[in-house]
Every structure is written in structure tokens, then in C-alpha cells.
């Protein structure tokens, strides 16, 4: 069964995404598995479905259970399961293991701690950050977008970090907290001006109209864990999120790989149902770090159809 674990605290907002993905135009139906009861879509309900998202605003311990999402895709309905557990708030400071998200590691040169699941919520900066339940204060700590940056990391910075933010739904505010462990590793490394491995500068990518196309932007930034390194795509000089074409999406998150000891990142641009107008766009792969920014441009061209039947 295609299932995903999700958890939250009572009286906080919890938003869960259907583990089965589909096009934005596909209808998604949600059910409470134990009773096969349909989850309403009306936002006046405390628990309601909104496309691929299931929203608990706020969550209650009794909401715990398995929820079924059915993506009404063509040909076959695709089924996913969200295993949701809502816990009572702890009176003491300790965050139990079952509430912890994945551990992240950092070093003197790279100390970014991402706030887990925040991309599912409608939140506004700044985030509040706590370490072992104490609010973080001092110039060494910087809340930047959805992550925390710690300057001059020391071994004493290891511990459990909690991010707290407000989710807004139709004018109502709901608190959300998420905790993950941070470990510090001693690392000898260096950073370079970004080197883009793919695509080649001014590359022409052949695509077929009506099919999907993937473009991968891949760059290396030095050795060891890097501080503030990123790769991203732009369309005609505009961020993907601002361009406003739902068929064209960046893959969520950046994959970090170490090839020959080098720290590299890649970002996949997915174009669904390629259209003629996509051939007119300029696709820019951008790689940036503290040294600067490098840009490689790609254009699409129509592929000459070839017979590939067996």
C-alpha cells in the first residue's frame, strides 16, 4: 500500500498531502478509512479536504487514524493512504522521538536547518526557532525564509530545534510546530565559484509535443557541505513560481550528491504536456553560492518523431 506517516499536536494545524501525486486538474477524494466516510470539502469543517491536501484546523487526538485519498486520474483511480497520528501536547520540555522529523547535519561552513513540512502551509515570515524549548536569541542565529542559519557552528549547537509558525486559512490563524535534531560534524572543505555540469551552455533540448520533458540543472560548489549553495530554474528570466504556468514545475527540494568528493546539487524542471509555446521560452539553469552566480541557457526544439515500436 502506498502510504505515508504524518503526525501533529492537538490544537495545532496539520496539513497532509496525498502520497499519490497527479496533475492539478485531477479530482482527489478523501475518506476516513475505518468508517469509509467521505471527508467534506467545505472549509467550514474543522477537518476538510482541499484537492491533494487534507487539512486539520486544528487537529484533535481523535483525528488519529488512516485516511484514504483517491486520485481520480484517467484510466485508473490511484489510491494512497495517510497514516495520521495526533498527540497530546507535552507538559514538559522534552520532545519525544515519535514527534521528531529527520535529523540534519551541519558543519562550520553549513548550518542550515529547514523547518519540516512548512511548504504545505500558508505561512508568513518570520519563523520562530527554539532549541531545547528555549527561544533562540543572539546574532549567531538568523531565521531566513523556511530555514535557520547558525553562524560559527560549534559542537554545543547540536540538539533539538523546533520551528514555530502561523498557518492562515481564510483569515483564521493556527499555530504549527515541528522539531528535528541537528548534529554537528567536523569537516574540512572548501567552496568554489559554481560549476554547472548540466545543461551545457546554449544547449538545445529535443522534446515531443504533448509528452513530458524533464530538464536537469546540475552544479557543483566545492568540497564538503556547502553554505548557501543553490540551483534553480528561471523561465524568460522569471522564477518558476512567479511565471504562473502550472504545467511547468520545479522538483520540490534539491538533491544533494557528492561526486568525487564534490558537493553538487540538482534541480529538475518538469514540463507536462509540452506545448508549441514552450519552444519559445528561454530556460535558465542558475547556480549560486557566496562566490557568485553562473547561468546556463537551454532552449527546446521539436523532436523529429522516430518509430520506437517493438
Amino acid at each position: 500500500k502506498f502510504s505515508k506517516q504524518s503526525w501533529g499536536l492537538e490544537n495545532e494545524a496539520l496539513i497532509v498531502r496525498c502520497p499519490r501525486q497527479g496533475k492539478p486538474s485531477y479530482t482527489v477524494d478523501w475518506y476516513y478509512s475505518q468508517t469509509n466516510k467521505s471527508i467534506p470539502t467545505q472549509e467550514r469543517n474543522r477537518v476538510f479536504a482541499s484537492g491533494q491536501l487534507l487539512k486539520f484546523l486544528p487537529a484533535a487526538v481523535a483525528d488519529s487514524g488512516i485516511y484514504t485519498c483517491i486520485v481520480r486520474s484517467p484510466t485508473f483511480n490511484r489510491t494512497g493512504y495517510a497514516n495520521v497520528t495526533i498527540y497530546k501536547k507535552q507538559s514538559d520540555c522534552n520532545v519525544p522521538d515519535y514527534l521528531m522529523y529527520s535529523t540534519v547535519s551541519g558543519s562550520e561552513k553549513n548550518s542550515k536547518i529547514y523547518c519540516p513540512t512548512i511548504d504545505l502551509y500558508n505561512w508568513t515570515a518570520p519563523l520562530e526557532w527554539f532549541k531545547n524549548c528555549q527561544a533562540l536569541q543572539g546574532s549567531r542565529y538568523r531565521a531566513h525564509k523556511s530555514f535557520l542559519v547558525i553562524d560559527n557552528v560549534m559542537t554545543e549547537d547540536a540538539g533539538d530545534y523546533t520551528c514555530k509558525f502561523i498557518h492562515n486559512e481564510n483569515g483564521a490563524n493556527y499555530s504549527v510546530t515541528a522539531t528535528r535534531s541537528f548534529t554537528v560534524k567536523d569537516e574540512q572543505g572548501f567552496s568554489l565559484f559554481p560549476v554547472i555540469g548540466a545543461p551545457a551552455q546554449n544547449e538545445i533540448k529535443e522534446v515531443e509535443i504533448g509528452k513530458n520533458a524533464n530538464l536537469t540543472c546540475s552544479a557543483c560548489f566545492g568540497k564538503g557541505t556547502q553554505f548557501l549553495a543553490a540551483v534553480l530554474w528561471q523561465l524568460n528570466g522569471t522564477k518558476i513560481t512567479d511565471f504562473g504556468e502550472p504545467r511547468i514545475q520545479q522538483e520540490e527540494g534539491q538533491n544533494q550528491s557528492f561526486s568525487n568528493g564534490l558537493a553538487c546539487l540538482d534541480m529538475v524542471l518538469r514540463i507536462a504536456d509540452v506545448k508549441e509555446e514552450d519552444l519559445l521560452l528561454q530556460y535558465d539553469c542558475l547556480a549560486l553560492n557566496l562566490h557568485g552566480l553562473r547561468r546556463h541557457t537551454v532552449r527546446l526544439s521539436r523532436k523529429n518523431p522516430i518509430d520506437h515500436h517493438s
Epitope: R20, Q21, G22, K23, S25, T75, F76, T79, G210, N212
Partner: antibody, heavy 121, light 111 residues
Framework: EVQLVESGGGLVQPGGSLRLSCAAS????????MYWVRQATGKGLEWVSA???????YYPGSVKGRFTISRENAKNSLYLQMNSLRVGDTAVYYC???????????????WGQGTTVTVSS | DIVMTQSPLSLPVTPGEPASISCRSG???????????LDWYLQKPGQSPQLLIY???NRASGVPDRFSGSGSGTDFTLKISRVEAEDVGVYYC????????FGQGTRLEIK
């Protein structure tokens, strides 16, 4: 070259079992939905089963409970386990490639050469 | 199940002449994503089926441009602008909106 090759067909008695295999090559097998389609001699095409990229399976009523489709991505292989076979299951069985991992659809664009299953006493 | 009905069942054509096959579905094949989930396949004598048209009107890779698909909802047409000898075989329409069902097939033969 993108290719699908079926095997495992043969003669079997009614009530018997048979396991068909389909070896895929030339594409990322794990990223595609896969299908079995059959064709009785002189008849039309009939969809038999499908399996999506996460292993969920789909069947028409005529074979549900008797046939089981499965896949082994590490071996680029698709299987059809056929139990409680009936004379009416006699046909050429084709495996075919369907849409890709993000539900884009562009038909069954690759077909194998087929393997013959004969159910007779 | 969605029933697919093709006509004619047999189609004798003179080479160089156009040909047209109709396919009617028991319910609309138009999905909320804006596409008609209707394919056309050709099975040449002694061969496996091959995809010609997907999503109603999109020609598959390697398919000559004399083949075209049209229609929406419940009525679809496959047209061959100039029939060639190699086009002989059985043509099937197939719906992929709700599971999969094929039409009964149209046999195209050369006069």
C-alpha cells in the same frame, strides 16, 4: 531500442495455472504503468490487467480473482500469474507499456510480440 | 464498462483514396484535464498492435502524417488521407477514461 519480450505461454488443461513473463529493455521500466492485453484467434483485443508504478493492480471482472499481475523493477520484468484457467482464456497475450510516472498519458506505445496460451483438455 | 462501437467493420479501399473509420463511446471520454482518452491502434496481419493516435488527436512517434484523429466526447474519427498498401490490417479504437475497453475492430483491405 525500446523492447518488450513475452514468454511462458503454452498448453494447459482447464483449471490449471501458467505464469507469463515480459522482459523490458531500452527504457526506465520502473517509471511506467504496464499492461497485459489478450487476443483470441480471429477476435479483437481485450484488456486483461494493469500495474502502476507503485505496484497497485487493476483487473476487469472477467479475470479478477484468477489472474495476478506483478512487476520486478530490479529485473525489468512484468509477470502475469494465471490460475483456474478456462477454455475462454485461450489467446495470444501481449504486454504493453502505458503512461509514465507522473500520470501523463500517451497510449500503449510499446507492445511485445505476444505469447500464446492454449487452455484445452 | 464503457462500450466502444466501431463502424464500418469492413472497409475496402482503393490505394491513394482516403478512408475514414468511426468510433462511438457509450459515454463521454472527455476528462476534467481537457483531454479525450481515446486511442487508435493498427494491427497489421501477423503482427502486434501498434499505437497510431493517442488522446483523440495526437499522432504517435513514427506514424505517417496521412493518419489523423479527430472528435470529442463520444464521437471520434480516424482518417487516412491516402491509403497505401501497408495500411492493411485491423484498426481498433480504445478508451482509457475508465479502465480500458477496445472497439470490435475495423478491417481495412485493398480493393
Amino acid at each position: 531500442e525500446v523492447q518488450l519480450v513475452e514468454s511462458g505461454g503454452g498448453l494447459v488443461q482447464p483449471g490449471g495455472s501458467l505464469r507469463l513473463s515480459c522482459a523490458a529493455s531500452g527504457f526506465t521500466f520502473s517509471s511506467y504503468d504496464m499492461y497485459w492485453v489478450r487476443q483470441a484467434t480471429g477476435k479483437g483485443l481485450e484488456w486483461v490487467s494493469a500495474i502502476d508504478t507503485v505496484g497497485d493492480t487493476y483487473y476487469p471482472g472477467s479475470v479478477k480473482g484468477r489472474f495476478t499481475i506483478s512487476r520486478e523493477n530490479a529485473k525489468n520484468s512484468l509477470y502475469l500469474q494465471m490460475n483456474s484457467l478456462r477454455v475462454g482464456d485461450t489467446a495470444v497475450y501481449y504486454c504493453a507499456r502505458g503512461g509514465d510516472y507522473d500520470y501523463s498519458y500517451y497510449g500503449m506505445d510499446v507492445w511485445g510480440q505476444g505469447t500464446t496460451v492454449t487452455v484445452s483438455s | 464498462d464503457i462500450v466502444m462501437t466501431q463502424s464500418p467493420l469492413s472497409l475496402p479501399v482503393t490505394p491513394g483514396e482516403p478512408a475514414s473509420i468511426s468510433c462511438r463511446s457509450g459515454q463521454s471520454l472527455l476528462h476534467s484535464d481537457g483531454y479525450n482518452y481515446l486511442d487508435w491502434y493498427l494491427q497489421k496481419p501477423g503482427q502486434s498492435p501498434q499505437l497510431l493516435i493517442y488522446l483523440g488527436s495526437n499522432r504517435a512517434s513514427g506514424v505517417p502524417d496521412r493518419f489523423s484523429g479527430s472528435g470529442s466526447g463520444t464521437d471520434f474519427t480516424l482518417k487516412i488521407s491516402r491509403v497505401e498498401a501497408e495500411d492493411v490490417g485491423v484498426y481498433y479504437c480504445m478508451q482509457a477514461l475508465q479502465t480500458i475497453t477496445f472497439g470490435q475492430g475495423t478491417r481495412l483491405e485493398i480493393k
